[in-house]
């Protein structure tokens, strides 16, 4: 089976603009690429299947997405702990200043869209 987690965080050193609503824009693609690479680094251990339903909102930039793991390989607490532990490296490697991290269980990935 698969476990899904809804993750929300702020990138306080970036500014939202309307191009972050469109996946064909440079800004969207660059930020999505950095975030995707970052999560591959954070959850290197077996069990991480990927991320989906990425959405950007105003508030500097608020990022909302769904993470997928093989069932039983990680829990909500560990998802949040590992992400928080990576904040310093995210700043140095990707120039992303991360704050206000929130993680919750979701029954299926599309919940992130509501």
């Amino acid at each position: 089976g698969v476990s899904f987690f809804f993750l929300s965080f702020h990138i306080s050193n970036l500014q939202f603009n309307s191009s972050l609503e469109d996946p064909s824009t440079d800004y969207y693609q660059e930020l999505q690429r950095d975030i995707s690479e970052m999560f591959l680094q954070i959850y290197k251990q077996g069990g991480f299947l990927g991320l989906s339903n990425i959405k950007f909102r105003p508030g500097s930039v608020v990022v909302q997405l769904t993470l997928a793991f093989r069932e039983g390989t990680i829990n909500v607490h560990d998802v949040e702990t590992q992400f928080n532990q990576y904040k310093t490296e995210a700043a140095s490697r990707y120039n992303l200043t991360i704050s206000d991290v929130s993680v919750s269980d979701v029954p299926f990935p599309f919940s992130a869209q509501s």
């Epitope: 603009n17 309307s18 996946p23 064909s24 824009t25 440079d26 959405k55 909102r57 105003p58 509501s114």
Partner: antibody
Framework: EVQLVQSGAEVVKPGASVKMSCKTS????????INWVRQRPGQGLEWIGY????????EYNEKFKGRVTLTSDTSASTAYMELSSLRSEDTAVYYC??????????WGQGTLVTVSS | DIQLTQSPSSLSASVGDRVTITCRAS??????LNWLQQKPGKAIKRLIY???SLDSGVPSRFSGSRSGSDYTLTISSLQPEDFATYYC?????????FGGGTKVEIK
């Protein structure tokens, strides 16, 4: 089915203001952007600005800055555009267009504003 | 501001004809271009997004492509319901801008 329903036609006097609405329905996202565009009689399309529904985040075309105010009400899924200091050349159909995974995905039917003394 | 030069401004064609409309961008806009259809008294409809992606429910006779700074909307076999005005729209940078429009009329 996604729908954008705009408020009805307005006739206003030069120098006055007009406020129109754009109500959206039929989509699962509760947060998204609304762009506003106008079309003067017999002319092409002109971008006015953008608001992210439920936030105070806005972008404006410099041409309209100072005369246009974009606001929204998340609970009513409605965006508003107010245009002030109206002149005859503001006579136009004003459209809202909402994002749906990408920009300008769905369009309203338009609100005709006639500026006349 | 980025200028979009759309041509032709109008054209006459018959049902079944292949129709091509072009937009030239004054600056690099990547793939950030949409094609819109406007019919009198109806809401504007997006046909193509991101240069070449067909919107849901849009017939496959519509297609979009790019060659350098030239962007093309093609209608492979014009149908009666396709007589309308078409606009290109760039959203690479603000202010977002539109082409001048192409009115497709019945020959």
């Amino acid at each position: 089915e996604v729908q954008l329903v705009q408020s009805g036609a307005e006739v206003v006097k030069p120098g006055a203001s007009v406020k129109m609405s754009c109500k959206t329905s039929g989509y699962t996202f509760t947060s998204y952007g609304i762009n506003w565009v106008r079309q003067r009689p017999g002319q092409g399309l002109e971008w006015i600005g953008y608001i992210y529904l439920g936030s105070d985040y806005t972008e404006y075309n410099e041409k309209f800055k100072g005369r246009v105010t974009l606001t929204s009400d998340t609970s009513a899924s409605t965006a508003y555009m107010e245009l002030s200091s109206l002149r005859s050349e503001d006579t136009a159909v004003y459209y809202c267009a909402r994002s749906a995974g990408s920009l300008f995905g769905y369009w309203g039917q338009g609100t005709l504003v006639t500026v006349s003394s | 501001d980025i200028q979009l030069t759309q041509s032709p401004s109008s054209l006459s064609a018959s049902v079944g004809d292949r129709v091509t409309i072009t937009c030239r961008a004054s600056q690099d806009i990547g793939i950030t271009l949409n094609w819109l259809q406007q019919k009198p008294g109806k809401a504007i409809k997006r046909l193509i997004y991101a240069t070449s992606s067909l919107d849901s429910g849009v017939p496959s006779r519509f297609s979009g492509s790019r060659s350098g700074s030239d962007y093309t909307l093609t209608i492979s076999s014009l149908q009666p319901e396709d007589f309308a005005t078409y606009y290109c729209l760039q959203y690479a940078s603000s202010p977002y801008t539109f082409g001048g429009g192409t009115k497709v009329e019945i020959k």
